[in-house]
Interface confidence: low
């Protein structure tokens, strides 16, 4: 066949015209409503996109494809029926009206139509396969999307939970930081106060050092004068001795005076010396001498002063050895010496009286009816019994007694080093209610001092006293 044209008639039927030689054949076929027109050619791969489709679009497109398939199927069935009907009619007409040799042409046309039908069916099968393929793909994509959405939701929940935890942690840490800041402010204030105190101490010590330097210069000058005086006195003494030996040989009735020694101020008092002052004391069976101040007036007299503080002129931050043998000036501030006191108080029973003065003109005392110190091997541990007096109902020297501690011998009960922190040698506990060998603070600088001269049960923890005296006397005096 040479030509095969298609056109539309007025009642919506498709007109197929076939030209063969001098004859032309026209077929009128019905057109399906939803069939794709030739003006919008079908693209076979249009649905095979790799990019994910929106779910609603995919469903719509699937419905359209299903409708097209259904319509095509109906159209094919109608076409077959139409062809069969027309075939019968045309065959009759051909047999009646046409020449016998046109039969071949008719068969050719019919064959052509059948081929077209077969081609259309094959195309529809392709489309159906493509639709199924696309449907499967869409289902897989939907499943993947669903899984991905679940995974994302879980991740979001986990992250939200993590954010909440971090927020809680942040608020906790903020609170902690604020608390620490408060703490640090207080600590800094405390450190500043201590620094101020230390600066005052340093300036005070500087002035003391200057004074001492002046005294040393004066003492050096005085020393040379004294040496000359001593030399002169020695000559005088030698002359006197010569004279005495001469007179003794002439007068044998003059007895040689015995050398008398005293173990304590009680013995000095009993020997008739009833004036306050510095006396030389010697322990029995010993040649070692110590100079001590004897109070011959207070409470009947006979008191051996073992410690005195009155003006801050002597540094009490001393070593173990210095506290052992004693230091200072017996007429002023001094420490008699732990070794002497230990030996003395272990030979007989002694009482201890502690006399205190504050900066307001008040005085108080604590009296212990039995006092002794252990030996050096036991760190000069203090032993006290029977407290009376006006400086507190409770003993400000911790009971039971503690070992003696100094800046170089830490024998206290504190993880700290009380002697280094509070200054001075003392029978520290941890660190305890007293320290009469602490820093000497002048008036108006004597409060809120943790390292001052302290007797807690009289004046409290931060009060530094004006004056202290520790004195001992035999219990049977």
């Amino acid at each position: 066949y040479n030509n095969f044209r298609k056109s539309m008639d007025s009642i919506g039927k498709k007109q197929y015209q076939v030209q063969h030689g001098s004859c032309s054949y026209t077929f009128l076929l019905p057109e399906m409503d939803n069939c794709r027109s030739s003006s919008s050619p079908y693209v076979s791969n249009a649905v095979q996109r790799d990019a994910p489709l929106e779910y609603d679009d995919s469903v719509q497109r699937l419905q359209v494809l299903e409708n097209i398939m259904e319509n095509n199927t109906q159209w094919l069935m109608k076409l077959e029926n139409y062809i069969q009907d027309n075939m019968k009619k045309e065959m009759v007409e051909i047999q009646q009206n046409a020449v016998q040799n046109q039969t071949a042409v008719m068969i050719e046309v019919v064959t052509n139509l059948l081929n077209q039908t077969a081609e259309q069916t094959r195309k529809l099968t392709d489309v159906e396969a493509q639709v199924l393929n696309q449907t499967t793909r869409l289902e897989l994509q939907l499943l993947e999307h669903s899984l991905s959405t679940n995974k994302l939701e879980k991740q979001i929940l986990d992250q939200t939970s993590e954010i909440n935890k971090l927020q809680d942690k942040n608020s906790f840490l903020e609170k902690k930081v604020l608390a620490m800041e408060d703490k640090h402010i207080i600590q800094l204030q405390s450190i500043k106060e201590e620094k101020d105190q230390l600066q005052v101490l340093v300036s005070k010590q500087n002035s003391i050092i200057e004074e001492l330097e002046k005294k040393i210069v004066t003492a050096t000058v005085n020393n040379s004068v004294l040496q000359k005086q001593q030399h002169d006195l020695m000559e005088t003494v030698n002359n006197l001795l010569t004279m005495m030996s001469t007179s003794n040989s002439k007068d044998p009735t003059v007895a040689k005076e015995e050398q008398i020694s005293f173990r304590d101020c009680a013995e000095v008092f009993k020997s008739g010396h009833t004036t306050n002052g510095v006396y030389t004391l010697t322990l029995p069976n010993s040649t070692e001498e110590v100079k001590a101040y004897c109070d011959m007036e207070a409470g009947g007299g006979g008191w051996t002063i073992i410690q005195r503080r009155e003006d801050g002129s002597v540094d009490f931050q001393r070593t173990w050895k210095e506290y052992k043998v004693g230091f200072g000036n017996p007429s002023g501030e001094y420490w008699l010496g732990n070794e002497f006191v230990s030996q003395l108080t272990n030979q007989q029973r002694y009482v201890l009286k502690i006399h205190l003065k504050d900066w307001e003109g008040n005085e108080a005392y604590s009296l212990y009816e039995h006092f002794y110190l252990s030996s050096e091997e036991l760190n000069y541990r203090i032993h006290l019994k029977g407290l009376t007096g006006t400086a507190g109902k409770i003993s400000s020297i911790s009971q039971p007694g503690n070992d003696f501690s100094t800046k170089d011998a830490d024998n206290d009960k504190c993880i700290c080093k009380c002697s280094q922190m509070l200054t001075g040698g003392w029978w520290f506990d941890a660190c305890g209610p007293s320290n009469l060998n602490g820093m000497y603070y002048p008036q108006r600088q004597n409060t809120n001092k943790f390292n001052g001269i302290k007797w807690y049960y009289w004046k409290g923890s931060g009060y530094s006293l004006k004056g202290t005296t520790m004195m001992i006397r035999p219990a049977d005096f």
């Epitope: 207080i186 600590q187 409770i394 504190c414 941890a430 305890g432 943790f450 807690y456 049960y457 409290g460």
Partner: nanobody, 126 residues
């Protein structure tokens, strides 16, 4: 504002137990000696127990030794007094106080104590 707040008091039968708490606010307790004191109307205030700041050394008045335990939790800024085997003579208002001047004192007389709580009543009665 510096404050000490006692809690945990109440009515208890002889032989019973109570735990008193002293919570500090406005300052850190770490560097303070802390004391528990009690007072019966018409009598002098008595130091019951104290604890030092630096090393936790404790002091107890003879009448409570072996029965009462003082402890401190610096992290919570709180001091506790665990009272066991309570006796009728333990009935009193219990106060806590801090000593900032003494630093390491464990003395328990109440002299020089800067801050005091408002007190909590402890009554031991059958």
């Amino acid at each position: 504002e510096v404050q000490l707040v006692e809690s945990g008091g109440g009515l208890v039968q002889p032989g019973g137990s109570l735990r008193l708490s002293c919570a500090a606010s406005g300052f850190a307790l770490d560097y303070y000696a802390i004391g528990w004191f009690r007072q019966v109307p018409g009598k002098e205030r008595e130091g019951v127990s104290c604890i030092s700041s630096s090393d936790g050394i404790t002091y107890y008045v003879d009448s409570v030794k072996g029965r009462f335990t003082i402890s401190r939790d610096n992290a919570k800024n709180t001091v506790y007094l665990q009272m066991n085997s309570l006796k009728p003579e333990d009935t009193a208002v219990y106060y806590c106080a801090t000593d900032s001047g003494g630093y390491i004192d464990y003395d328990c007389m109440g002299l020089g104590y800067d801050y005091w709580g408002q007190g909590t009543q402890v009554t031991v009665s059958s």
